[in-house]
Interface confidence: medium
């Protein structure tokens, strides 16, 4: 499969475990992948009694679950780790939980930050 309509070159980056993993905490990530594979952005988080704990954001490699998704929407009902992916630069800035089995849609807005570019 070739690159999608919304070609992904950069994603919002975040790592809650940045100190232990010796990475930046947040910024922008340039996505790199194989020539014939699509690139995506993702966001992952936990929901502990209504409190959202962001886990990671960044680039995600070729995944049919992300194809042609312009918004980052997690659809699993009650997972251990919520996960969404999408196509298009910085599409993982906002992320949403909309379970396929029905239930309220919850959208998470990021706090304003000064991004750092990761290469």
């Amino acid at each position: 499969s070739g690159r999608g309509e919304a070609e992904t070159r950069e994603c919002i980056y975040y790592n809650a475990n940045w100190e232990l993993e010796r990475t930046n905490q947040s910024g922008l990530e340039r996505c790199e992948g194989e020539q014939d594979k699509r690139l995506h952005c993702y966001a992952s988080w936990r929901n502990s009694s209504g409190t959202i704990e962001l886990v990671k954001k960044g680039c995600w490699l070729d995944d049919f679950n992300c194809y042609d998704r312009q918004e980052c929407v997690a659809t699993e009902e009650n997972p251990q780790v919520y996960f969404c992916c999408c196509e298009g630069n910085f599409c993982n800035e906002r992320f949403t939980h909309l379970p396929e089995a029905g239930g309220p849609e919850v959208t998470y807005e990021p706090p304003p930050t000064a991004p750092t570019l990761l290469t």
């Epitope: 993993e21 992952s44 886990v55 995944d63 049919f64 699993e76 251990q80 780790v81 396929e100």
Partner: antibody
Framework: EVQLLESGGGLVQPGGSLRLSCAAS????????MTWVRQAPGKGLEWVSV????????YYADSVKGRFTISRDNSKNTLYLQMNSLRAEDTAVYYC???????????WGQGTTVTVSS | DIQMTQSPSSVSASVGDRVTITCRAS??????LAWYQQKPGKAPKLLIY???SLQSGVPSRFSGSGSGTDFTLTISSLQPEDFATYYC?????????FGGGTKVEIK
């Protein structure tokens, strides 16, 4: 209780075909990607194929591409693996497994044995 | 494809020992790694997901760490039921490749 139960394994000659089934219960089957993993006798685990919850997306390992077809019937809560042009090296225990990709496979079946031999 | 290399391939240990298994990816996979335990004749069981998160119901003596290319599974105090083969698996890029396995045997 979340459960997966494989069936359809057996002895088949090289070049032959076999269809494996995996019956799921205890969870909303259509909401999850499903995977086949195999294990040759005395060897490690080998990822074979995955299908999206809707059935619209699939991936295959290079070793089975063009010979194996993964499919699902969400109305029957059943996952399938159609195996054609079987080779001796396809001899293995075949497991079906549930799980979102990022977490890994959190539920596995007990496995069904496929033997390809003349 | 991303290659996963596990070491050692086998380790002999006694009950109560601390056991460490390592897994190396051929390219960076962030923390998208799972660890499984498999006993003879049984299906694998998920122990750790996202490199360091303990799967529900798994004893706390199991822990995972690492990010990027280097990962570790640690059993802090080996119990009789822990003698098994352990596999890592990267879930960052299809195909979702496994490591070759590490057999933990009784010394």
């Amino acid at each position: 209780e979340v459960q997966l139960l494989e069936s359809g394994g057996g002895l088949v000659q090289p070049g032959g075909s076999l269809r494996l089934s995996c019956a799921a219960s205890g969870f909303t089957f259509g909401s999850y990607g499903m995977t086949w993993v195999r294990q040759a006798p005395g060897k490690g685990l080998e990822w074979v194929s995955v299908i999206s919850g809707s059935g619209g997306g699939t991936y295959y390992a290079d070793s089975v591409k063009g010979r194996f077809t993964i499919s699902r019937d969400n109305s029957k809560n059943t996952l399938y693996l159609q195996m054609n042009s079987l080779r001796a090296e396809d001899t293995a225990v075949y497991y079906c497994a549930k799980g979102p990709r990022i977490v890994g496979m959190d539920v596995w079946g007990q496995g069904t044995t496929v033997t390809v031999s003349s | 494809d991303i290659q996963m290399t596990q070491s050692p391939s086998s380790v002999s240990a006694s009950v109560g020992d601390r056991v460490t298994i390592t897994c190396r990816a051929s390219q960076g996979i962030s923390s998208w790694l799972a660890w499984y335990q498999q006993k003879p004749g049984k299906a694998p069981k998920l122990l750790i997901y996202a490199a360091s998160s303990l799967q529900s119901g798994v004893p706390s003596r199991f822990s995972g760490s690492g990010s990027g290319t280097d990962f570790t599974l640690t059993i802090s105090s080996l119990q009789p039921e822990d003698f098994a083969t352990y596999y890592c698996q990267q879930v960052f890029s299809y195909p979702l490749t496994f490591g070759g396995g590490t057999k933990v045997e009784i010394k």
